[in-house]
């Protein structure tokens, strides 16, 4: 069977006026996953995003991440889009320096 990912979105200061938003997916199986940032509902181009490898996390499941740099104050226009085993979920950017975990249920 499949194990849905835990998705976690965080933000960190980049340069002045910019922040880096990172979306991490962990504890999922099988390893095939789509993880991408969307702006105003549409996927960003590949050259504006950085991806981590899909790696084993030691429990028979996998983890990966995607990040992009955006203008501070525009965070609400962005969502992390996750697709795994025919299911999808969207994960907004939290305000301030907080972070939030979403568990995606199949």
């Amino acid at each position: 069977g499949s194990v849905p990912p835990m998705v976690n979105v965080t933000r960190s200061e980049a340069s002045e006026g910019n922040i880096t938003v990172t979306c991490r997916a962990s504890s999922f199986y099988p390893r095939n996953i789509t993880l991408t940032w969307r702006q105003d509902g549409v996927s960003l181009s590949h050259d504006t995003q950085q991806w981590g490898d899909v790696l084993p996390d030691g429990n028979g499941t996998y983890q990966t991440w995607v990040a992009t740099r955006i203008c501070q104050g525009e965070e609400q226009r962005f969502t992390c889009y996750m697709e795994h085993s025919g299911n999808h979920s969207t994960h907004p950017v939290p305000s301030g320096n907080s972070h939030h975990h979403h568990h995606h249920h199949h």
Epitope: G41, F78, H88, T90
Partner: antibody, heavy 117, light 107 residues
Framework: EVQLVQSGAEVKKPGSSVKVSCKAS????????IEWVRQAPGQGLEWIGA????????NYNEKFKDRATLTADKSTNTAYMELSSLRSEDTAVYFC??????????WGQGTLVTVSS | DIQMTQSPSSLSASVGDRVTITCRAS??????LAWYQQKPGKAPKLLIY???TLADGVPSRFSGSGSGTDFTLTISSLQPEDFATYYC?????????FGQGTKVEIK
């Protein structure tokens, strides 16, 4: 102009199924998620689920997971919502809407589904 | 699931009145809140998104505020076409949930 045009009203028997269509125009259909919401007579709004028309991947409200099936046909720019094992409580207006980032910006006109024996 | 509670459930007001509707979330939804207006037999119409951003074509008498768990929709000077039902909706996490609605009626 973005438009979502839904199929016409339906009258169904308890235990049967209904399939509502939502034809999109005026934008790139596969770029945006399509959401489904229902509203029982005189009641509030309830989210059913969403589909990515590009990939077919879905996200369901747990309440509807066992009875709702969302699909999309890229060749006709049409999304579908099928609800099975209908009961009287499913009598409602069913809406499709486009997900623009983090809100629904355009809605279909609604489809009334009446479940009656 | 995040519960959205709107108040009041209905109100009576006159043209020109200032009207305020509140929406409270059962958890932190940051600023991921939208307000819709719905008239009988019609689909909801987007008024405000991200808690305070006015949607295209919406008159400036409508405004939204709040973040976290408490939000407000204000109509600064009620017009005849504003008599309708208003809903809030959270977009922080699925299932996306709506408030139960506030019906604005003519006094």
């Amino acid at each position: 102009e973005v438009q979502l045009v839904q199929s016409g009203a339906e009258v169904k028997k308890p235990g049967s199924s209904v399939k509502v269509s939502c034809k999109a125009s005026g934008y790139a259909f596969t770029n945006y998620l399509i959401e489904w919401v229902r509203q029982a007579p005189g009641q509030g709004l309830e989210w059913i689920g969403a589909i990515n028309p590009g990939s077919g991947a879905t996200n369901y409200n747990e309440k509807f997971k066992d009875r709702a099936t969302l699909t999309a046909d890229k060749s006709t720019n049409t999304a579908y919502m099928e609800l099975s094992s209908l009961r009287s409580e499913d009598t409602a207006v069913y809406f499709c809407a486009r997900f623009l980032g983090n809100y629904f910006d355009n809605w279909g006109q609604g489809t009334l589904v009446t479940v009656s024996s | 699931d995040i519960q959205m509670t709107q108040s009041p459930s209905s109100l009576s007001a006159s043209v020109g009145d200032r009207v305020t509707i509140t929406c409270r979330a059962s958890g932190n939804i940051h600023s991921y809140l939208a307000w819709y207006q719905q008239k009988p037999g019609k689909a909801p119409k987007l008024l405000i998104y991200y808690a305070e951003t006015l949607a295209d074509g919406v008159p400036s008498r409508f405004s939204g505020s709040g973040s976290g768990t408490d939000f407000t929709l204000t109509i600064s000077s009620l017009q005849p076409e504003d008599f309708a039902t208003y809903y809030c909706q959270q977009f922080w996490t699925t299932p996306y949930t709506f408030g139960q609605g506030t019906k604005v009626e003519i006094k």
